[in-house]
């Protein structure tokens, strides 16, 4: 058992049938030593008397919010959280598995550019009942602070029968350094909390491998005198990092054809322009990546050739 | 370079930025492995960084690109003797077209260009980690290559805009 | 796209030698090392050597020593395989490949495949 | 040479089901194990790179995994287009073999 916090402890219980479960000891937070009782949840039934109660803690039912009493008066309380652990593994029923890039990614993050911000997220089909709180830090032996921000609702999806959620949060590095080679990796953990039943779940990883930058703002297209073909520019997207003359991006562009079916060819270049075949109903799309490092691409920045 | 000289700042861009898509080649992303699951950073905590204090930063390029520029060569030298060691020449066989032979010369090519003849700054030691068994070696050698990527992105950022700002 | 075009079937008599030809395109040919693999009727893949022809180096498998001759003409972007004194154990279909441009030997295009009948 | 040992040589299974493919290594290979499928007539096709990477366009009940010297091939719910000969290669060290075959066929 440990302390999540003030009065909130959590049961680490080995689960499979007939486990013997753990033994819990509770101490009422009081200078009285005489006439204690204890309840739980809402439950009037006395569960037992005295400063301390011993309870063994086995399935869901044993947990909750623990009261000690004095003459009808709540003296202190303790709730008491389960933390699954089936075959040797940490339970995860709250998050859904998202399988990108890999088979249990419950946590995904992004960052816009290298200035220490960036967003996780994850996914739950449980509506209600349901807590996160989100710490991070780079490195864990000797961890360096990031702060991060509240949980939000960021979006409901209906899929098939049922109702998917997504939580995130933003969180910043205290002192970043953009420029630096990082060494030690961001670390950020989640604890979810739904009724009773504690899990967390964390994430590791360096900004430069979660970087995905905005698409390029600004497509233009200017038709060539006597040609088919059209000079079509673009710009880096506000939220890149800057000098761009240091943290420059590459960019594929293709041409799409109305049929999804048609050929795109695709070509790359470090220039903000290019001359290209626009045909009627083709449009024209664009997206970066960062010019040195093989992260993310980003979404793609279109337009209408006609 | 040494002594405060310039470098050839777009020979520099255009050789860091070939190292960069080697070092790519060499090791594309690969979903399921990552590396640092595998609980030995001691392998590689050894290897050279460009860290804050290195001036490898716009302001500090443009204050005195020399502390930048003998960081970056000194990762340059750490990272050519790797690649020549027996890490990368025993098994699992790499085979002669693999983009680690050129990542190799094209490492000393860049270090040689910031160090003409006749300059020697001082290299720090380079560890001889000898992994007997392939497997060992070849997780090695990707957190090798993986830090290899980071630490050639920096470096090429460092030459273009140097090239873009500082060429005479 | 990458592309392996290998010539067609072969009906050889005991003692003689073959020429398989394996022609590349939609990659710089030497840039890739080209490697054989033969398959005997019913039976596995054996790997049997490669040719990189940036410096026409080949390597071969200990077991085709003697037996196999690997070579390539960069002016088409062609590689060989030649099989000399045939027995009728020599008869299979025979693969060229390339592999993974990271450097190991895991092979994504493979030629149709050649199939080498020896028989008296 | 190493030897890559593969089980069964053949297998019967319908569809649907869960097939286990497997392969030994007669000394370590690392993670140096690719696996491909062949279809009658046909020329083998890359599956499975670094013992458990799907190489592009490959279905995702196709799944590796292993290291060292023991190596398995799954297919999580088997579809009749996977009537096949399906072999292991080791690409560790010269020469580089192959398993001897697993041939898959529908009940």
């Known amino acids: 058992i440990w302390e999540l916090k003030k009065d909130v402890y959590v049961v680490e219980l080995d689960w499979y049938p007939d486990a013997p479960g753990e033994m819990v000891v509770l101490t009422c937070d009081t200078p009285e030593e005489d006439g204690i009782t204890w309840t739980l949840d809402q439950s009037g039934e006395v569960l037992g008397s005295g400063k301390t109660l011993t309870i063994q803690v086995k399935e869901f039912g044993d947990a909750g919010q623990y009261t000690c009493h004095k003459g009808g008066e709540a003296l202190s309380h303790s709730l008491l959280l389960l933390h699954k652990k089936e075959d040797g593994i940490w339970s995860t029923d709250v998050l859904k598995d998202q399988k990108e890039p890999k088979n249990k990614t419950f946590l995904r993050c992004e960052a816009k550019n290298y200035s220490g911000r960036f967003t996780c997220w994850w996914l739950t089909t449980i509506s209600t009942d349901l807590t996160f709180s989100v710490k991070s830090s780079r490195g864990s032996s000797n961890p360096q602070g990031v702060t991060c921000g509240a949980v939000t609702l960021s979006a409901e999806r209906v899929r098939g029968d049922n109702k998917e959620y997504e939580y995130s949060v933003e969180c910043q590095e205290d002192s970043a350094c953009p420029a630096a080679e990082e060494r030690l990796p961001i670390e950020v953990m989640v604890d979810a909390i739904h009724k009773l039943k504690y899990e967390n779940y964390t994430s590791s990883f360096f900004i430069r491998d979660i970087i995905k930058p905005d698409p390029p703002k600004n497509l233009q297209l200017k038709p060539l005198k006597n040609s088919r073909q059209v000079e079509v520019s673009w710009e880096y997207p506000d939220t890149w990092s800057t000098p761009h003359s240091y943290f420059s991006l590459t960019f594929c562009i293709q041409v799409q054809g109305k049929s999804k079916r048609e050929k795109k060819d695709r070509i790359f270049t470090d220039k903000t322009s290019a001359t290209v075949i626009c045909r009627k109903n083709a449009s024209f799309s664009v997206q970066a990546q960062d010019r040195y490092y093989s992260s993310s691409w980003s979404e793609w920045a279109s337009v209408p050739c006609s | 370079v040494p002594g405060g000289s310039s470098p050839a700042w777009a020979q520099c861009q255009q050789l860091s930025q070939k190292l960069c898509t080697l070092a790519w080649s060499a090791h594309p992303l690969v979903g399921h492995m990552d590396l640092r699951e595998e609980g030995d950073e001691e392998t590689t905590n050894d290897v050279p960084h460009i860290q804050c204090g290195d001036g490898c930063d716009p302001q500090g390029l443009r204050d005195n690109s020399q502390f930048c520029l003998q960081r970056i060569r000194q990762g340059l030298i750490f990272y050519e003797k790797l690649l020549g060691s027996d890490i990368f020449t025993g098994e699992p066989s790499l085979l002669p077209d693999s983009p680690v032979g050129q990542l190799h010369a094209s490492l000393l090519g860049l270090s040689q260009l910031l160090q003409p003849e006749g300059h020697h700054w001082e290299t720090q030691q380079i560890p001889s980690p000898s992994p007997s068994q392939p497997w060992q070696r070849l997780l090695l050698r990707f957190k090798i290559l993986r830090s290899l990527q980071a630490f050639v992105a920096v470096a090429a950022r460092v030459f273009a805009h140097g090239a873009a700002t500082l060429s005479p | 796209q990458v592309q392996l075009v290998q010539s067609g079937a072969e009906v050889k008599k005991p003692g003689s030698s073959v020429k398989v030809s394996c022609k590349a395109s939609g990659f710089t040919f030497t840039d890739q090392t080209i490697h054989w693999v033969r398959q005997a009727p019913g039976q596995g893949l054996e790997w049997m050597g490669y040719i990189y022809p940036r410096d026409d180096s080949p390597k071969y498998n200990e077991n085709f020593k003697g037996k196999v001759t690997l070579t390539a003409d960069k002016s088409t972007s062609t590689a060989y395989m030649e099989l000399s004194s045939l027995r009728s154990e020599d008869t299979a279909v025979y693969y060229c490949a390339i592999p993974d441009r990271s450097g190991y030997a895991w092979f994504i295009y493979w030629g149709q495949g050649t199939l080498v009948t020896v028989s008296s | 040479d190493i030897q890559m040992t593969q089980s069964p040589s053949s297998l019967s299974a319908s569809v649907g089901d869960r097939v286990t493919i497997t392969c030994k290594a007669s000394r370590d290979v690392a993670i140096a194990v690719a696996w491909y499928q062949q279809k009658p007539g046909k020329v083998p096709k890359l599956l499975i790179y670094w013992a458990s990477t799907r190489h592009t366009g490959v279905p995702s009940r196709f799944s590796g995994s292993g290291s060292r010297t023991d190596f398995t091939l799954t297919i999580s719910s088997l579809q009749p287009e996977d009537v096949a000969d399906y072999f292991c290669?080791?690409?560790?060290?010269?020469?580089?073999?192959f398993g001897s075959g697993t041939k898959l066929e529908i009940k």
């Open positions: 290669h080791q690409y560790s060290s010269y020469p580089f073999t």
